[in-house]
């Protein structure tokens, strides 16, 4: 984790339910004015939605993101529908970015 890290992490205040990376990212961006959102396990707990803010503009209570915290592992398969009742994504020929294969680990840091 290099010096000058600028992403601060804060548990989402608005996300509930089983964590889904696409929904978490959307919730953090749209509702919490974050840069991004991602699902992670912290300690031995369940996977939760964390929002990532620019540390220089972060809300109270945000802490520097731990090494390799974001972005999330990519979810395999087809994407889930939007979290806020918008139209679901088009079929696979139209913008779904599922990965070919399973879930790689989060990007490593050195």
């Amino acid at each position: 984790h290099m010096a000058g890290s600028k992403l601060c992490e804060k548990t989402s205040k608005t996300y509930s339910g089983k964590c889904d990376n696409k929904k978490c990212d959307k919730k953090c961006i749209e509702w919490e004015k974050a840069q991004h959102g991602a699902c992670h396990k912290r300690e031995a707990g369940k996977e939760s939605c964390f929002c990532y803010f620019d540390c220089s503009k972060s809300p109270p209570g945000a802490t520097p993101a731990p090494p390799g915290a974001a972005p999330p592992p990519a979810a395999g398969g087809s994407p889930s529908p939007p979290a806020d009742g918008g139209s679901p994504p088009p079929p696979a020929d139209g913008g779904s970015p599922p990965v070919d294969g399973g879930s790689p680990p989060p990007p490593s840091t050195h």
Epitope: Q35, P71, A74
Partner: antibody, heavy 117, light 107 residues
Framework: QVQLKESGPGLVAPSQSLSITCTVS????????VHWVRQPPGKGLEWLGV???????NYNSALMSRLSISKDNSKSQVFLKMNSLQTDDTAIYYC???????????WGQGTTLTVSS | DIQMTQSPSSLSASLGERVSLTCRAS??????LSWLQQKPDGTITRLIY???TLYSGVPKRFSGSRSGSDYSLTISSLESEDFADYYC?????????FGGGTKLEIK
């Protein structure tokens, strides 16, 4: 099938204003963010700004004073407005969709803007 | 702003060759990096997001990796349609910023 298509005036005189439209199909603007990026002739890409699904905007601070992004969800259109144009605003202007949980996954073909008297 | 230093700026290679392009971030971007391909006609297509995740439909000869603040795009065996310009994009912090680009030419 996801598509984005930019349309603009082509030629604008210096100090004038610009309006470029991005018309999308295959997805709804209430579900996705749309970003604007430009590319001056022979140069690299520059991020201009974004309008998110809920209507919130973020801009490149270097251009924020003369840039405005808006949209009409019902018409599936996103608008880029820029004022006080100078010759170095000459570029290809692209719109692109942000797929939540990933990044910019679909791009328009771009529209060329020339700022010249 | 975060500076993305992309290298090399141009590269000549032969069909079937393995090539790697690199982007270095001036600040921590926590893996929020994507790679894009731009064809001579200006068409831009997605390749990779989150540093190493391939978008669906992208050939498996493309791969992305990260080592600290260095991010790499590797094409394992060049095909004729791969000769194009390539850009990295950091989308961790506003303003999002692109690398200067790499022009990949046929030798």
């Amino acid at each position: 099938q996801v598509q984005l298509k930019e349309s603009g005036p082509g030629l604008v005189a210096p100090s004038q204003s610009l309006s470029i439209t991005c018309t999308v199909s295959g997805f709804s603007l209430i579900s996705y963010g749309v970003h604007w990026v430009r590319q001056p002739p022979g140069k690299g890409l520059e991020w201009l700004g974004v309008i998110w699904a809920g209507g919130r905007t973020n801009y490149n601070s270097a251009l924020m004073s003369r840039l405005s992004i808006s949209k009409d969800n019902s018409k599936s259109q996103v608008f880029l407005k820029m004022n006080s144009l100078q010759t170095d605003d000459t570029a290809i202007y692209y719109c692109a969709r942000y797929y939540y949980g990933s990044s910019l996954d679909y791009w328009g073909q771009g529209t060329t803007l020339t700022v010249s008297s | 702003d975060i500076q993305m230093t992309q290298s090399p700026s141009s590269l000549s290679a032969s069909l079937g060759e393995r090539v790697s392009l690199t982007c270095r971030a001036s600040q921590e971007i926590s893996g929020y990096l994507s790679w894009l391909q731009q064809k001579p006609d200006g068409t831009i297509t997605r390749l990779i997001y989150a540093a190493s995740t391939l978008y669906s439909g992208v050939p498996k000869r493309f791969s992305g990796s990260r080592s600290g603040s260095d991010y790499s795009l590797t094409i394992s065996s060049l095909e004729s349609e791969d000769f194009a310009d390539y850009y990295c994009l950091q989308y961790a912090i506003y303003p999002w910023t692109f690398g200067g680009g790499t022009k990949l030419e046929i030798k």
